[in-house]
Structures are given as C-alpha cells and as structure tokens.
Interface confidence: medium
C-alpha cells in the first residue's frame, strides 16, 4: 500500500477545453477556463447565443466565445442583414427570360410573352387560341404555336398544297414548301445552283479565286471541278509536295533531300552521280580525296539535280 | 488601437451638440462602441451601444428619446438631443471587448467633457 | 431596467491586506459577462477581469473575480498603495427584457 503513488490534484490536468489547472489544496484543484468555457473542469461551452443580432428569422448557432447566423433563403451576412439579390443569382430566379426585380426579403419576376407563374416557368398554352387546318396537328410552342401538317398540305395553318409533291428540285436537292405562298425552295447541293437546282456551278470561273494551289489547272466538270497538277504536286486541290524521297533513290548510304518536283542525293564520301551510284576513281588519295568530296558537295546542285515524272490521270 | 473623443464644450440647454469617437487600429464593423458619462464625482451611467454588423441600437430605458447614436467606417457619434444640466459630465467611447459580443469594455477613450449652464 | 448594487460606497485597507467588493445584479447577468473596472481620477475606466472570473492581459494577478448568476466578488490581495482607486462591476443583461448594460455604482478603495 506504501508504494501508491501521491494523488497530486493538477497531473494530469482534470481541467479540458485548453483550461489551466491551479492547485488549491492538497487535494483541491481550481481550473482556470478559457474565454467561451465554464464548468469545474471548463467542460461546458457558454452559450452564446443570449442577445444574439441575428436578424430577419435568422437562427443563432452557438460557437466557442462566438456565434454563427443561419439565414433564411432570402438573406445574407453575418447577422442576416443583408438581402440576396436573387437577380444576380445562377441559374437566374425568373425562368425563360423573364425580367427579375430584387425586392427586400424577396423577388419579383416579369414575364415574356408566352410564360407566366412567379418564376415564369410556366408555358401558356397557344394552342388553346390556334388556328391550325382541320386535320392538322397543334403544336404548342413558347408565346406560338406550329401546325404539323398532314402529307400534301403545307403553310403556317397548313392550309395550303405542298408544291413539294411533284418533286420539283434535281439532283437530289432538298425542296421546302414557302410557309406564307405554298411554293417550293430548293436547296442546292454543291456544284450545283437555280430555281430547280440543274445548273452547273463553274468552280473554275468563280471571281474569288483559283480552287487549284500551287498553280495547277482549274478543269471544270458537271457539279464539280478537277485541278491538273504541275510536276512535284498531287491531291484533289494541288494542295500535297510530292516527297520524291520516298522511293529511297540515293543509293550507298547517301542523304536525300526532297525538292519541288525532284530531289538531291548527299554522296558518302567516295561516291558520286545522281543516285550516287558511282565510285570515285580509286586513283586519287589522301587530301585529294577530302578535296573531291568537298567539290561534290558544293556543287551538288550542278551534279545532282535529279527528277521523279509525276503522270497526271484526267 | 486607440478610441478618442471630441466635441465637448459648454452649452446651453436645449442646444442640441453632436459627440463624435473617431477610432483608429480596429474596424467598426467587427466591434460593438457604447457610450458611457460620468457625471462629476458620480458613477459610470451607460447611455447606448452601437452593435457591430447589424448597426443595431440599444440605448438604456433612462436615454431613450434623448441621444441618438450613430457611426460611419471611423466615427461613432453622440447626440444630445436637447441638453438640460443634468447631462453636464465627462462622456467616454468605450469598445466592445468580444467580436460580436457586448460583454466587457477593453478599450476606452479619454472622454470629452460637456458642460450644461445657462 | 436592471441594477447592480455594489454594498459599500468605500472600504478602507491596510497595505498587503485583503479587500473584497461584492455586487448584487438585480436579474442573472448573460453568461456570467460580469466585468470589474479600476478608474483613478481623470483617468477612463480600466478593465481588470471579465466573464466574471478572467484576468485581463496585463493585469496583476493579485485581483481575482468570482461568483455567478447575480452575486459577484473582486478581491484584492496584498494591496498596495497604486490600488487606491474606485471600482465598477459592470454586466450585460437580456436587451430584450430592458437595458443591455448596466454599472454598479463604485466602491472607493482607500489605502490606510
């Protein structure tokens, strides 16, 4: 029974919440509690709340030493003081493009044509006024409405022929039938153009420019065009730098660089000709070898100018 | 942080006179300011305070009617509304010890004296 | 409106003794914010303890604030001759039952 340990009254502190534990006694203690904290052992929070500011059927809650508000939808600020301005929110409190009207505690929507309710959210119905053909079928639409119309009839009201009908438009051109007059429109697929779409558009003699690059031939076809490429071009437009290099023409190692319409092969040392496919005479050696090399490398453009035919198919 | 107040002087009664407690080193909107006088050789009489965010006044049940509190971003003002010899004592800014909370007062003023005679 | 009473208007204390002001509220002061102030002649206030039992910063520890509810206690220990002073409690009620604050009415402290 000796050997238990003397009770000491401040180790370890009882006092919690950050409060200080001060020795009253041999077996007293008092502690000291930080701000917001009360209790023996500070272990109860203060309610802060007692005259609180929160305003506007704000609802205090409790902190330590502090308080929070917690606001009703249409107010903000530390004390609910401030009003929301539900204009300025995301998505906008007046639907459908209704005009907002901040009010204190509130908000006000005025709506466009066709919409109605607080917040316009709600369609009004055209329909309920329309005056589509019998046989056709109201469609309510926002402050409209459209008429579907039964095969053969057209218009706003569908209370006209569908000049459609007799497949006016060629070469496969889309035909609408005009809403106020019941005449048909077609729409031109390209290469094509007029009234009923069978005119040939000349892509060739157009003002803006040659659709051919590179100064290929402009070649005018039935709905189209065709360009006739200058040697080292290809594509539909002339538009591609054939690369003459891809056929690997340089032989013995040498570099090939690719040229419009041709290409140059880079000779290894000892090597000379187009393709490089020569050897240089044996006969010559040391500096008049280096000497060689370097002369065929300065005038390669002399020497190596070499040449790919490109056929053109029409 | 400091507190100080001005525009007392000597009046006569009725004469409406405008305190004013210019504040430096703390915003008013996170601190409470009372106003609190002392008339001379009496206690310490608590006018009205100015709360913090809300702005909302208190005054005390005996001042109701015959001070009126105010605040800009750096001032908290004081007005006797019509002054009697009553109101003669020194007039003191006191600040809010807690954000938010009345509480205490950990900061005053030096106070300004206003003097009440015909 | 809420009233705290300070009992004596004066008490009178030898230097290293013991002085010990009480003031009664009128009606349970909010959260025990009950604050205790040391004001010498042409000097403001000065703020000692407050929630009725903290020290201010830089005050000596030899003040100690006690009570609860509507009874309070500052006690000065080992007074020394700059403690001649008069004291205010000062606490803060319900504003919505009356006045928010309210001062005691001062004990002088005299230092024989």
């Known amino acids: 029974a000796g050997s238990d340990s003397p009770y000491v009254p401040c180790a370890p502190s009882p006092c919690v919440n950050g409060g200080t534990c001060r020795q009253t006694g041999d077996f007293t203690f008092e502690c000291n509690c930080l701000p917001g904290f009360e209790g023996s052992t500070c272990e109860r929070n203060i309610d802060d709340c007692p005259n609180h500011r929160c305003q506007n059927g704000g609802v205090c809650v409790d902190g330590v030493n502090t308080y929070n508000c917690r606001c009703p939808p249409q107010w903000t600020g530390q004390f609910c003081t401030e009003d929301v301005d539900e204009c300025l929110l995301q998505p906008n409190a007046c639907q459908n493009g209704g005009t907002c009207t901040n009010r204190n505690g509130g908000y006000g929507c005025v709506c466009v044509n066709g919409w109605s309710g607080d917040d316009c959210s709600e369609n009004i119905d055209d329909c309920a006024y329309a005056s589509c053909t019998p046989g056709s079928t109201c469609i309510d639409r926002v402050a409209s409405f459209s008429c579907l119309c039964p095969e053969g009839k057209a218009g706003l009201l569908c209370h006209l022929d569908d000049a459609c009908i007799s497949n006016p438009c060629h070469k496969g051109a889309l035909c609408d039938t005009n809403p106020l007059n019941g005449q048909y429109i077609c729409t031109c697929p390209q290469g094509y153009k007029g009234a009923d779409c069978t005119e040939d558009v000349d892509e060739c003699a157009m003002a803006n420019s040659n659709p051919c690059e590179h100064a290929g031939k402009c070649v005018n076809t039935d709905g189209a065009f065709h360009c006739e490429c200058l040697k080292g071009y290809a594509g539909p437009r002339c538009e591609m730098d054939i690369n003459e290099c891809h056929s690997d023409p340089c032989q013995n190692d040498a570099t090939c660089l690719d040229k419009i319409g041709g290409f140059t092969c880079l000779c290894m040392p000892g090597f000379k000709g187009v393709h490089c496919e020569l050897e240089v005479n044996e006969g010559n050696s040391g500096l008049n070898d280096i000497f060689e090399a370097q002369k065929i490398e300065w005038h390669e453009n002399l020497y190596f100018q070499g040449h790919h035919h490109h056929h053109h198919h029409h | 942080q400091s507190v100080e107040e001005s525009g007392g002087r000597l009046v006569t009664p009725g004469t409406p006179l405008t305190l004013t407690c210019t504040v430096s080193g703390f915003s008013l909107s996170s601190y409470d300011m009372s106003w609190v006088r002392q008339a001379p050789g009496k206690g310490l009489e608590w006018i009205g305070i100015i709360q913090a965010g809300s702005n909302t006044l208190f005054y005390a049940s005996w001042a109701k009617g015959r001070f009126t509190i105010s605040k800009t971003s750096t001032t908290v003002d004081l007005k006797i509304t019509s002054p009697t010899t009553e109101d003669t004592a020194t007039y003191f800014c006191?600040?809010?010890?807690?954000?938010?909370?009345?509480?205490?007062?950990?900061?005053w003023g030096p106070g300004t004296l206003v003097t009440v005679s015909s | 409106a809420q009233v705290l009473t300070q009992t004596a208007s004066s008490v009178s204390a030898a230097v290293g003794g013991t002085v010990t002001i009480n003031c009664q509220a009128s009606q349970s002061v909010v959260n025990n914010r009950l604050a205790w102030y040391q004001q010498k002649p042409g000097q403001p206030p000065k703020l000692l303890m407050y929630?009725?039992?903290t020290l201010e910063s830089g005050v000596s520890s030899r003040f100690k604030g006690s009570g609860s509810g509507t009874q309070f206690t500052l006690t000065i220990s080992g007074v020394q001759c700059d403690d001649a002073a008069t004291y205010y409690c000062?606490?803060?009620?319900?504003?919505?039952?009356?006045?928010?604050?309210?001062f005691g009415g001062g004990t002088k402290v005299e230092i024989k």
């Open positions: 006191a600040r809010g010890g807690v954000i938010f909370i009345i509480g205490h007062f950990n900061l």
């Open positions: 929630g009725a039992s």
């Open positions: 000062q606490g803060e009620f319900l504003c919505s039952s009356g006045d928010c604050v309210a």
